[in-house]
């Protein structure tokens, strides 16, 4: 997860990213039919709020990473965990919250001078289908011009929100993560009541923009829990 800096205060001061189910990304109101499980095209509803299992960091929200919940626990069982803040211990970039990266086992702030187009470092990361171990390896990473020489525009492949231009966040879209617009007032958002409840979604919405929060739409208060529509509203 090689990324540069958070681009603006508008991104920095936002509430935690909220994954979401498929709907028209730019529409003011859209349906949210549920979550799509990797390996299948069938939807399920999203009203059970236990921590979801995951196989990789990309299956978690932008403020989460995928790991075993207990240090000595079953390494084969992984769930989405809250990202590590600055100065916390880490093993790989994805463990650190947006705007930070993992350096020498500690989450440190990404700064403008850190990424210069081509870097060399050691990354500890899990990949492939075997998630029972964390494989440490060194690699020289060439940051593609498409992705990193300029901030990613809408639709650009990204790894973290800091790869994206102002007003965009990095959100999962099927097997990729791409830059999507931060949600505006009135747009549908997805409220997760417990961390990790969106680990299996493969279509994530961005979070609500500055000064907005994801709340139940007023005329939906009487609806059942499973069908209540959340939209971005002024604080």
């Amino acid at each position: 997860t090689l990324n540069s800096v958070l681009n603006s205060n508008a991104i920095k001061n936002l509430p935690p990213p909220l994954g979401g189910a498929a709907g028209h990304p730019g529409s003011a109101v859209s349906a949210a039919p549920g979550i799509l499980y990797p390996g299948g095209n069938k939807y399920q509803t999203i009203d059970n709020y236990q921590p979801y299992p995951c196989a990789e960091d990309e299956e978690c929200g932008t403020d989460e990473y995928c790991a075993s919940p207990t240090r000595g626990g079953d390494a084969g069982v992984q769930i989405c965990l809250a990202c590590r803040k600055r100065r916390k211990r880490c093993m790989r970039h994805a463990m650190c919250c947006p705007g930070n990266y993992c350096k020498n086992g500690i989450c440190v702030s990404s700064d403008q001078n850190h990424f210069r187009g081509e870097i060399e470092e050691t990354i500890t990361e899990s990949f492939g289908n075997d998630h029972s171990t964390l494989d440490g390896y060194s690699r020289r990473t060439t940051l593609s011009s498409k992705m990193y020489h300029t901030k990613g525009q809408e639709g650009s492949v990204c790894l973290r929100s800091s790869d994206c231009a102002s007003g965009l966040c990095c959100a999962r879209h099927f097997w990729s993560k791409i830059c999507k617009p931060v949600l505006k007032e009135g747009q549908v958002c997805t409220k997760h009541r417990r961390k990790g409840s969106h680990g299996l979604e493969i279509f994530q919405r961005c979070y609500c923009g500055e000064g907005l929060s994801c709340r139940i739409q007023k005329d939906h208060h009487q609806a059942s829990n499973s069908s209540r529509l959340h939209t971005c509203q002024r604080h």
Epitope: G26, A55, E58, E59, F127, N129, V157, W175, S176, I178
Partner: antibody, heavy 117, light 107 residues
Framework: EVQLLESGGGLVQPGGSLRLSCAAS????????MSWVRQAPGKGLEWVSA???????YYADSVKGRFTISRDNSKNTLYLQMNSLRAEDTAVYYC???????????WGQGTLVTVSS | DIQMTQSPSSLSASVGDRVTITCRSS??????LNWYQQKPGKAPKLLIY???RLESGVPSRFSGSGSGTDFTLTISSLQPEDFATYYC?????????FGGGTKVEIK
């Protein structure tokens, strides 16, 4: 230069199996999702399967339970294991790299799979 | 599944002509629409992604427009090498689906 080179196609009987490979070069393979897309003779394009950089897999309903996509990031190679093959699986199979907007920005030259008795 | 409908299925044009191909999706797909060119015996080649963004190395005579359900690929001045089949593809929801193709032939 990005290159994708498929192999493993051929003639197989209905119910048989085949394993396709796609050797990738010119880019950091493990950072990209990869897909298989097929094209029956004289027909249009059909997405078959995809796999994320670290191994999460996705399938079209038409091949689910019969085809298995996988990748070996250490060998920069993508695979498609095709079992219980049917006549309607006859097609040129392309491997393709996932890019911006989840478009397929690079394609291999294709390998022909013929299922016939 | 989202159905992608291209029109026309084929057209005849001359070098220098302005050519327009349309693609319609069965439901809104925002800007998640890509265009490909395919020549006989060759692999498809990405032309336009995100409805209107020109892929690197693709001549500027190709352009894309549209959002929601209606999209257009335009070739401003047809060149001899442009005679091919063109496909649209949605990347908004799974399964990813392609249009049936538009064959551009020499008049």
């Amino acid at each position: 230069e990005v290159q994708l080179l498929e192999s493993g196609g051929g003639l197989v009987q209905p119910g048989g199996s085949l394993r396709l490979s796609c050797a990738a070069s010119g880019f950091n393979f493990r950072d990209y999702a990869m897909s298989w897309v097929r094209q029956a003779p004289g027909k249009g394009l059909e997405w078959v399967s995809a796999i994320s950089g670290r191994g999460s897999v996705y399938y079209a309903d038409s091949v689910k339970g019969r085809f298995t996509i996988s990748r070996d990031n250490s060998k920069n190679t993508l695979y498609l294991q095709m079992n219980s093959l049917r006549a309607e699986d006859t097609a040129v199979y392309y491997c393709a790299r996932g890019g911006d907007w989840v478009a397929f920005d690079y394609w291999g030259q294709g390998t022909l799979v013929t299922v016939s008795s | 599944d989202i159905q992608m409908t291209q029109s026309p299925s084929s057209l005849s044009a001359s070098v220098g002509d302005r050519v327009t191909i349309t693609c319609r999706s069965s439901q809104s797909i925002s800007n998640y629409l890509n265009w490909y060119q395919q020549k006989p015996g060759k692999a498809p080649k990405l032309l336009i992604y995100g409805a209107s963004r020109l892929e690197s190395g693709v001549p500027s005579r190709f352009s894309g427009s549209g959002s929601g359900t209606d999209f257009t690929l335009t070739i401003s001045s047809l060149q001899p090498e442009d005679f091919a089949t063109y496909y649209c593809q949605q990347s908004y929801s799974l399964p990813l689906t392609f249009g049936g193709g538009t064959k551009v032939e020499i008049k």
